[in-house]
Interface confidence: low
């Protein structure tokens, strides 16, 4: 019997996710694969030899190799999941625990600027715990969460790139910024 620490797994809100069982090979000796959602100690899916596969609702799908698919992730799918595998003699041969964490995907960051005081802003509207990074002509300038404001002085024309990312997604925007000598908005 093998009990491991929880495997941290990240899923994107609204997307599907597969909880794959590492180092497990399905064989004729396997009689029972049972998935539980531990917050309510409820069985959510189960494979039994010579029996119909059980699933608590249609958002769950259990594959022959023991992988659990959760469809269209919702915030309340964030939970600790446990899979227990038994052989034909009733012996618990494997147990794995998955700590499923869910994030909203980041949206494409928006770059805006004003030539009056050569100030540029990059902001991201959507996404859980976004990390913003701002680059000027390929050089990293700043890191922040939702908004970056930057005053540039090196030249009136530059190419700015802003990237937003989290554990489940990454988006970027590139804007060539050009200001006249006088500094008009």
């Amino acid at each position: 019997k093998e009990i491991t620490n929880a495997l941290e797994t990240w899923g994107a809100l609204g997307q599907d996710i597969n909880l794959d069982i590492p180092s497990f090979q399905m064989s004729d000796d396997i009689d029972d694969i049972k998935w539980e959602k531990t917050s309510d100690k409820k069985k959510i899916a189960q494979f039994r030899k010579e029996k119909e596969t059980f699933k608590e609702k249609d958002t769950y799908k259990l594959f022959k190799n023991g992988t659990l698919k959760i469809k269209h992730l919702k915030t309340d799918d964030q939970d600790i999941y446990k899979v227990s595998i038994y052989d034909t003699k009733g012996k618990n041969v494997l147990e794995k625990i998955f700590d499923l964490k869910i994030q909203e995907r980041v949206s494409k960051p928006k770059i805006s600027w004003t030539c009056i005081n050569t100030t540029l802003t990059c902001e991201v509207m959507n996404g859980t715990d976004p990390e913003l990074n701002l680059y000027q002509d390929g050089k990293h300038l700043k890191l922040s969460q939702r908004v970056i404001t930057h005053k540039w002085t090196t030249s009136l024309s530059a190419k700015f790139k802003c990237t937003a990312g989290n554990k489940v997604s990454k988006e970027s925007s590139v804007e060539p910024v050009s200001c006249p000598e006088k500094g008009l908005d």
Epitope: S107, K110, I111, S112, E123, S173, E175
Partner: nanobody, 123 residues
């Protein structure tokens, strides 16, 4: 999903006026920046004007002649075009993007686009 519908295009003589309308549906209108862009045959799409909840911006070529405004109750943005010139002839597009108040001038910064309305200025 945000949908945009332009109207008000047409033909007018130089010096004349037109008012374009852009009706936005599908999202909380007041949270969006709405811009007008135009594209003449064989040319790139260019910025005309934009409006957010807190400000407006215009291309130098239309400043003093065009006025952008919005009616949040009707989910509509208007572009009042006065003293029209032949070089204003183009297909005019409205576009929308979420904004906390910044005015965006680049087409790449807009997520949603209308189908366009033709404006022809000719004697």
């Amino acid at each position: 999903q945000v949908q945009l519908q332009e109207s008000g295009g047409g033909s007018v003589q130089p010096g004349g006026s037109l008012r374009l309308s852009c009706t936005v549906s599908g999202r909380t209108f007041s949270n969006y920046a709405v811009g007008w862009f135009r594209q003449a045959p064989g040319k790139e799409r260019e910025f005309v004007a934009t409006i957010t909840g807190s400000g407006t911006a215009y291309a130098d070529s239309v400043k003093g002649r065009f006025t952008i405004s919005r009616d949040n109750a009707k989910n509509t943005v208007y572009l009042q075009m006065n003293s029209l010139k032949p070089e204003d002839t183009a297909v005019y597009y409205c576009a929308a993007t979420w904004s906390s108040g910044y005015t965006f001038r680049s087409p790449t910064q807009y997520d949603y686009w209308g189908q366009g309305t033709q404006v022809t200025v000719s004697s």
